[in-house]
């Protein structure tokens, strides 16, 4: 007869391992009694557990509770035995040591592997400015045995770095994401993707990226000048700009405090029906927690009576 | 030839205690499990205990758990079952056995001792 096992056995952390040893005998030869031993190299042999086909299932004080034969129905030549909750310090070498008659006794080894499945975590570097330099985005950390692998899925461009630190049972992998912060940045997504033979699929954790930038302002408004003539109505001008965290708009006359009936509206300032003394230099500032602009134009409120021409300056400063 | 020789039964009260023993000879003694059985009158032969070669792996009939311990000398070829807080279902004739599993035809098979009596009253 023979021994059938296998040379290793995988299994994830905190299931069930089947460790198998089944007698493949000759007719009428039978398996008087399975010895289970841990036989890790370096250590004397640990008895595991004995499975006797008169007295039973025998378990040794360390695994009680946690080595038992496989459910019904039992095939009196397999001596498998199945160990419950499989933990790391489980891993290594077992030998199963079959006694039959009338053939003697046969051994053989396996080794159980035990998986232990990462837990990544993401965090997000420092603050992202449009103007920095490379920048570290953010970096993904994931711990297992064996080592996980730790890659990126994102449209930004940018640059990967890893670095692992093996520990006695497992492994951490840290995986830097860095980038030139850009406006265009804003919002897309960047997605840590971990990877191991202890996971059905990859595990993805994703953070938003959120660059602070603040675009040059400019007013819009004055593009007909022959529109800001006296008496109008509805006149106004808008401040533009865009930017992340989202600017606020404060309006100011270079030359004056506002007229008065002139309205602001955040990025609009509404003026009531024109008269000369809303003619001026405005300008509107506009600010984030990252920058600030400026942008300034003159209005000049024409006087349909008079002839004289029409001047617009517009000017734009950061 | 394979012998096996049960001692230390009697008459105890309930809550007593006593110690079989058994002594072996003809075989490899630390090479195989050896088991303790009762008898009562009228009844089947149970097991009580087991013990594997080594003594590191024990088993118990759930009847007597916390109650006997079975251990062994493989020096003095003994074997031996420490009853504790008897009661008096567990008067029986106690067995000792070995089951030996590997080996020549001379020595493989089931070998039982002639029993000793232990009677638990009042």
């Known amino acids: 007869g023979e021994l059938e096992t296998s040379d290793v056995v995988t299994v994830v952390l905190g299931q069930d391992a089947k460790l198998p040893c089944f007698y493949r005998g000759d007719s009428g030869e039978q398996v008087g009694q399975v010895a289970w031993a841990r036989v890790d190299a370096g250590e004397g042999a640990q008895e595991l557990a004995l499975l006797h086909s008169k007295y039973g299932l025998h378990v040794s004080p360390a695994y009680e509770g946690r080595v038992e034969q496989p459910p019904p129905p039992r095939n009196p030549l397999d001596g498998s035995v199945l160990l419950r909750n499989a933990v790391q310090a489980d891993e290594g070498e077992y030998e199963c040591r079959v006694s039959t008659f009338p053939a003697g006794s046969f051994q053989a080894r396996l080794r159980l592997r035990v998986l232990v499945p990462p837990l990544p975590s993401l965090n997000p570097g420092p603050a992202l400015e449009e103007g920095q330099g490379l920048t570290l985005a953010a970096s993904c950390t994931a711990e297992g045995s064996p080592a996980p692998s730790v890659t990126w899925d994102t449209e930004v461009k940018g640059t990967t770095s890893s670095r692992s630190f093996k520990h006695s049972r497992s492994a951490a992998v840290t995986s830097e994401f860095h980038l030139v912060p850009s406006r265009s940045m804003n919002g897309q997504p960047l997605t840590c993707v971990v990877s191991h033979p202890g996971l059905l699929q990859d595990q993805r954790i994703t953070h938003i990226l959120h660059v602070s930038f603040l675009a040059e302002a400019s007013v819009r408004g004055l593009e007909d000048q022959n529109l800001w003539h006296i008496g109008r109505e509805g006149a106004m001008l808008k401040c533009l700009s865009e930017g992340q965290p989202p600017p606020s708009y404060n309006w100011t006359r270079l030359d004056g405090p506002l007229p008065s009936g002139v309205r602001v509206d955040g990025d609009t300032l509404g003026f009531p029906p024109l008269t000369t003394e809303h003619s001026g230099i405005y300008v509107c500032h506009v600010s984030n927690e990252f920058s600030s602009r400026d942008s300034q134009v003159t209005v000049d409120v024409l006087d349909p009576q008079e002839d004289s021409g029409k001047q617009v300056d517009l000017v734009s400063a950061s | 030839e394979v012998q096996l020789l049960e001692s230390g039964g009697g008459l105890v009260q309930p809550g007593g205690s006593l110690r079989l023993s058994c002594a072996a000879s003809g075989f490899t003694y630390s090479g195989y499990a050896m088991g303790w059985y009762r008898q009562a009158p009228g009844k089947e032969r149970e097991l009580v205990s087991s013990?594997?070669?080594?003594?590191?792996?024990?088993s118990y009939a759930d009847s007597v758990k916390g109650r006997f311990t079975i251990s062994r000398d493989n020096s003095k070829n003994t074997l031996y079952l420490q009853m504790n807080s008897l009661k008096p279902e567990d008067t029986a004739v106690y067995y000792c056995d070995v089951d030996i599993p590997v080996g020549d035809a001379t020595t493989v098979g089931d070998y039982w001792g002639q029993g000793t009596q232990v009677t638990v009253s009042s």
């Open positions: 013990i594997s070669g080594s003594g590191t792996l024990t």
